[in-house]
């Protein structure tokens, strides 16, 4: 009995034409939503003039349907038992699941003004940029619609820059009509314990963003894991959104629509400083903003974002050090709302429900040569938005899953 089930599972989780896993893998049967909350700045002038604390008020959710497109360019390699693919990106606004429209306006940090002196640290270039910032009437903060902020707008200051640079700015620009990948993952045909584990990403086994082992691409993409998951196992996965591999540990057993699943959670020590978790030393790549690598809860992903000062954290700076959140007022971190978890069915290793939560922040520093930033007396890691990407197995799929998998085992 058990041997037969194990054999069936091993056959059905292989990523090749005709298996249950493959069909769901090519195009997820789960509806995935990405909710956004935007941090609306309440005191922009006070901050720019007096370097006050930034008062923010989150507004949302604004919901989009994502991950509805099938994987493309799927190519099996029988030689090394891998399958390669790209994951197309797309987002469709869902007005009925949102508090407003894509035209709602927000006061947020001026992304281009904040990034320019960080990217161009040469003072002469900054003097030139300052004249263009003034000419374009740009300042430290700006008012932008949701659509502009997320998906891109033509920046008036960058449009004046006399050498060829991209003049379109957006937190997720470009997104629609782009792809993530190429991913090359093990199909599990020769070794089921390697199924879905990423062999390479964009043709490389390392990211080239981090020193040492932090640069490794570990585990799967979190949509599934090798079968027969034990509670003691650490689930490793790579997230291109945060430009790194990360891990989840067992949290609790949960009943999901009659299916017993293991809830794996991202532990606080994944975001700890090297002082608290020495394994994280290679995620600390600069000494100033990190207070000599003692700050925690924020990840500088600038190297992965063409040098832009982008920092990733958990929403509301959950699990972040006080020095990070101190200059910001209006944040209320909450473990239940703001943590990331994966609900994994242990026999198949399939993730049947998940909530990926992250916050996008931009570093803005005093810049002597940029008038809009020269009154700042300290650097700020400014929250722009946080997102909650969720997916849950549908009722029909859950019934089918119970019949075919968990039912048989009982």
């Amino acid at each position: 009995g058990d041997m037969l089930i194990e054999k069936t599972i091993k056959r059905e989780v292989v990523l090749e034409e005709g298996t249950t896993a493959f069909k769901n893998w090519v195009k997820t049967g789960t509806t995935v939503y990405r909710q956004f909350w935007i941090f609306d700045v309440q005191n922009p002038d006070d901050v720019a003039k007096n370097s006050s604390k930034i008062k923010v008020k989150q507004r949302g959710p604004y919901t989009y349907r994502v991950r509805y497109l099938a994987k493309e360019n799927i190519t099996q390699d029988p030689e090394d038992h891998t399958v390669s693919f790209v994951q197309p990106n797309g987002a469709i606004f869902e007005p009925s699941l949102s508090v407003g429209t894509e035209d709602d306006n927000f006061t947020v940090l001026n992304l281009a003004v904040a990034a320019a002196p960080h990217i161009y640290q040469n003072s002469f270039v900054q003097v030139v940029l300052n004249s263009l910032i003034k000419k374009s009437k740009s300042s430290m903060f700006q008012t932008r619609s949701l659509k502009e902020l997320l998906w891109g707008y033509k920046d008036p200051f960058l449009s004046l820059v006399p050498y060829p640079i991209s003049t379109t700015v957006g937190v997720f620009y470009p997104y629609n009509d782009t792809v993530d990948g190429v991913y090359k993952v093990f199909n599990g045909k020769d070794n089921i314990s390697k199924v879905a584990i990423i062999e390479s990403y964009k043709g490389k086994r390392n990211l080239s963003y981090w020193p040492s082992y932090c640069d490794m691409i570990n585990g799967t993409d979190a949509a599934s894991f090798p079968p027969f998951v034990e509670k003691s196992r650490t689930l490793r996965f790579f997230s291109s959104d945060i430009c790194r591999s990360i891990y989840a540990v067992f949290g609790s057993e949960i009943d999901l629509k009659g299916i017993p699943v293991y809830r794996f959670v991202l532990p606080a020590n994944a975001f700890a400083s090297p002082l608290q978790n020495p394994d994280n030393h290679c995620f600390c790549t600069e000494k100033v903003i990190s207070n000599n690598c003692t700050s925690y809860g924020v990840l500088d992903i600038g190297k992965c974002k063409e040098g832009k000062p982008v920092y990733i954290s958990l929403p509301h700076f959950l699990h972040a050090s006080p020095d990070v959140s101190e200059p910001i007022e209006g944040l209320h971190p909450n473990e239940d709302e703001h943590r990331t978890y994966l609900d994994v069915e242990p026999i198949t290793g399939f993730t049947l429900q998940f909530a990926k939560r992250l916050q996008v922040n931009i570093l803005v520093k005093p810049a002597r040569k940029i008038e809009a930033l020269k009154n700042l007396k300290r650097p700020y890691i400014v929250p722009i938005l946080w997102l909650n990407e969720t997916g849950t197995i549908g009722d029909e799929k859950a019934e089918m899953f119970k019949t075919q998998v968990t039912g048989k085992i009982k």
Epitope: Q121, S123, V128, Y163
Partner: antibody
Framework: EVQLQQSGPELVKPGASVKISCKTS????????MHWVKQSHGKSLEWIGG????????AYNQKFKNKATLTVDISSNTAYMALRSLASDDSAVYYC???????????????WGQGTLVTVSA | ETTVTQSPASLSVATGEKVTIRCITS??????MNWYQQRPGEPPNLLIS???TLRPGVPSRFSSSGYGTDFVFTIENTLSEDVADYYC?????????FGSGTRLEIK
Amino acid sequence: EVQLQQSGPELVKPGASVKISCKTSGYTFTEYTMHWVKQSHGKSLEWIGGIYPYNGGTAYNQKFKNKATLTVDISSNTAYMALRSLASDDSAVYYCASDYFYGDGYPWFTYWGQGTLVTVSA
Amino acid sequence: ETTVTQSPASLSVATGEKVTIRCITSTDIDDDMNWYQQRPGEPPNLLISEGNTLRPGVPSRFSSSGYGTDFVFTIENTLSEDVADYYCLQSDNLPFTFGSGTRLEIK
């Protein structure tokens, strides 16, 4: 040791053009800004413009916008200034001057070439 | 364009005396003022950079002060080797502009 070596003196006719060079050594060329400064005989200094070799970005004093063109050749660590439609009031010593900012305060025009005398005469 | 007015145009002092040169700008430039020395037949030499910062290797008898629009450059205990033209340069905004210069002579 940082050195900026400028090309020799030029005697040119009114209406003609001239191209002055400034060869650098002793530092990473792309990391330093290069400026050009004019000094007419017995007079003060005037900033003509600057170029950032890293990305070729330039900025000019409007007064010299139609007079000077700044370029660089990264392969030879050399900066150039071309002057066109020369007239007698363009007769001057022209200096190249570079500066480096990373983590060293804000020192402008730290290193200077020896100057190139351009004489415009019929 | 920020205009820089430098005074005096020339001055003559005995060695050991104090020299004061003043530059006034037409716009507020914070402390983005620089000071140069140009000896005869040589290119200018940066003595003091923005923020009244004395450059490495420059003798401590040279100093500057000022913020906004009014700036002063001082030489304490002038030496004969200080004979030169002195220029101020504002580096706050484009185009960068120099003062008209001050010629220092020794009596």
